[in-house]
């Protein structure tokens, strides 16, 4: 039978997703034990059917892994809880509509770093997703985004940084002082979302400069 | 069984407020959306707004935004429907629906009567 | 908004005859990632509720007998009724849920003749 609130059994049911690896998470209430177990059922919007996860039925961890199922980027998803305690009370919860464009987050980009004796040159990486295209290849957020740019900055001292950005993979910072620290940011940016990933950091030193010796 | 009851309606004055209940019976509240929608008498239906009765997030139709509250009680199975500022015009029947797009199932409603 | 615009207001039918009810939506309701469109036919009788007859503009309600079908997309939107029994008295309601806020057309009265 339900309990007199599904909050007692369930709680926080969300979908958290970045770079859109697509995971339902939630926490057991005040009344969860260990041993309650806990099933997983996904729809698409406007659909009647829920469809039962494989691999997270009965479950006692409390997250499931939905990117495969969620994969549609145009398409927006529900998925439910249904928690069943040892004693046979359950409870039962819903996320709220979930679009993966929309929702995911960004993590910071793969950049590599190269220091020279008078400039910093950095590459970034393109970042794999889950998602495929139709030919069955994993598509990059650049091929997702098509606004997608980087911005990096490079911290030259307190108050002065240096900044680039655009949408190619290469960049370089000139006119450096050799034998030198700096900080370098790299984020990426996606306007048309409002996303912005967290940043790369790198911390880079200058070469010294040979040519005096 | 499936099951939606209204209760709140009733005769309000002008500038006051109502607080309208849906029941949920055969069902859990929090395995669905509900919504309300309005009829006023002999015309056609009008959305009001929805809420997602696990989360209590919602969602409302622009005209009714300033006026408009929806709210859940998960523990009594019941989704609320608070309006303010009344006027004539406000005069309906108030239905909670629920399912997340188009509604399947539909309380029978309650009538409210704004007038003085 | 989507305005919803149905036509024509009342129709009078014969027992056994079809009734055509016509549904307009200001944009177009095809939902492209199932490639469906988000539109929906309601019954209502007086002093009831309104009651899910069609979804997804052609998919039939389980229950609801086969002589009520959808059809159309895009912008144009049919509900027919292939042949007119007493009970179908009612006014008939298409609504959309492409987008918010949803929105129904002004109803359409099927009477018998």
């Known amino acids: 039978h339900a309990p007199e609130d599904p909050s007692d059994l369930l709680q926080h049911v969300k979908f958290q997703s970045s770079n859109f690896e697509n995971i339902l998470t939630w926490d057991s209430g005040p009344e969860g034990t260990p041993d309650t177990v806990y099933s997983i059922e996904y729809k698409t919007y406007g659909e009647r059917d829920w469809v039962a996860k494989k691999g997270c039925q009965r479950i006692t961890r409390k997250s499931c892994n939905l990117t495969v199922e969620t994969g549609n980027l145009t398409e927006l998803y529900y998925a439910r809880v249904t928690a069943v305690s040892a004693g046979g009370r359950s409870a039962t919860k819903m996320t709220d509509r979930f679009s993966s464009l929309q929702h995911t987050t960004l993590k910071p980009p793969d950049v590599t770093c190269i220091s020279k004796v008078r400039s910093i040159q950095m590459i970034v990486h393109p970042t794999p997703t889950p998602i495929r295209a139709g030919d069955g290849h994993r598509l990059t957020l650049e091929d997702i985004f098509h606004d997608l740019f980087y911005h990096l900055e490079l911290q030259v001292n307190r108050t002065y940084q240096m900044h680039l950005g655009g949408k190619q993979r290469e960049y370089e910072f000139f006119g450096l002082t050799p034998d030198t620290e700096f900080l370098g940011t790299i984020m990426i940016c996606v306007p048309t979302w409002a996303k912005e990933s967290a940043p790369y950091m790198c911390r880079v030193k200058t070469l010294p400069d040979r040519t005096w010796t | 069984e499936v099951q939606l009851v209204e209760s709140g309606g009733g005769l309000v004055q002008p500038g006051g407020s109502l607080r309208l209940s849906c029941a949920a019976s055969?069902?859990?509240?929090?395995?669905?959306?509900m919504n309300w929608v309005r009829q006023a008498p002999g015309k056609g239906l009008e959305w009001i707004g929805e809420?997602?009765?696990?989360?209590?997030?919602?969602t409302y139709n622009q005209k009714f935004e300033a006026r408009a509250t929806l709210t859940v009680d998960q523990s009594k199975n019941t989704a609320y429907l608070q309006m303010n500022s009344l006027r004539a015009e406000d005069t309906a029947v108030y239905y909670c629906?629920?399912?997340?797009?188009?509604?399947?199932?539909w309380g029978q409603g309650t009538l409210v009567t704004v007038s003085s | 908004d989507i305005v919803m615009t149905q036509s024509p207001d009342s129709l009078a039918v014969s027992l056994g005859e079809r009734a055509t009810i016509n549904c307009k939506s200001s944009?177009?309701?095809?939902?492209?990632?199932?490639?469906?469109?988000?539109l929906a036919w309601y019954q209502q009788k007086p002093g009831q509720p309104p009651k899910l007859l069609i979804y997804?503009?052609?998919s039939r309600e389980s229950g609801v007998p086969d002589r009520f079908s959808g059809s159309g997309s895009g912008t144009d939107f049919t509900l027919t009724i292939s042949s007119l029994q007493a009970e179908d008295v009612a006014v008939y309601y298409c609504?959309?849920?492409?987008?918010?806020?949803?929105?129904f057309g002004q109803g359409t009265k099927v009477e018998i003749k």
């Open positions: 809420i997602n009765p696990s989360t209590g997030t919602t």
């Open positions: 997804w503009a052609s």
């Open positions: 629906a629920r399912f997340d797009a188009y509604f399947d199932y």
């Open positions: 055969g069902y859990s509240l929090t395995a669905d959306y």
């Open positions: 609504q959309q849920y492409f987008s918010y806020p949803f929105t």
């Open positions: 944009q177009s309701l095809l939902y492209s990632s199932n490639q469906k469109n988000s």
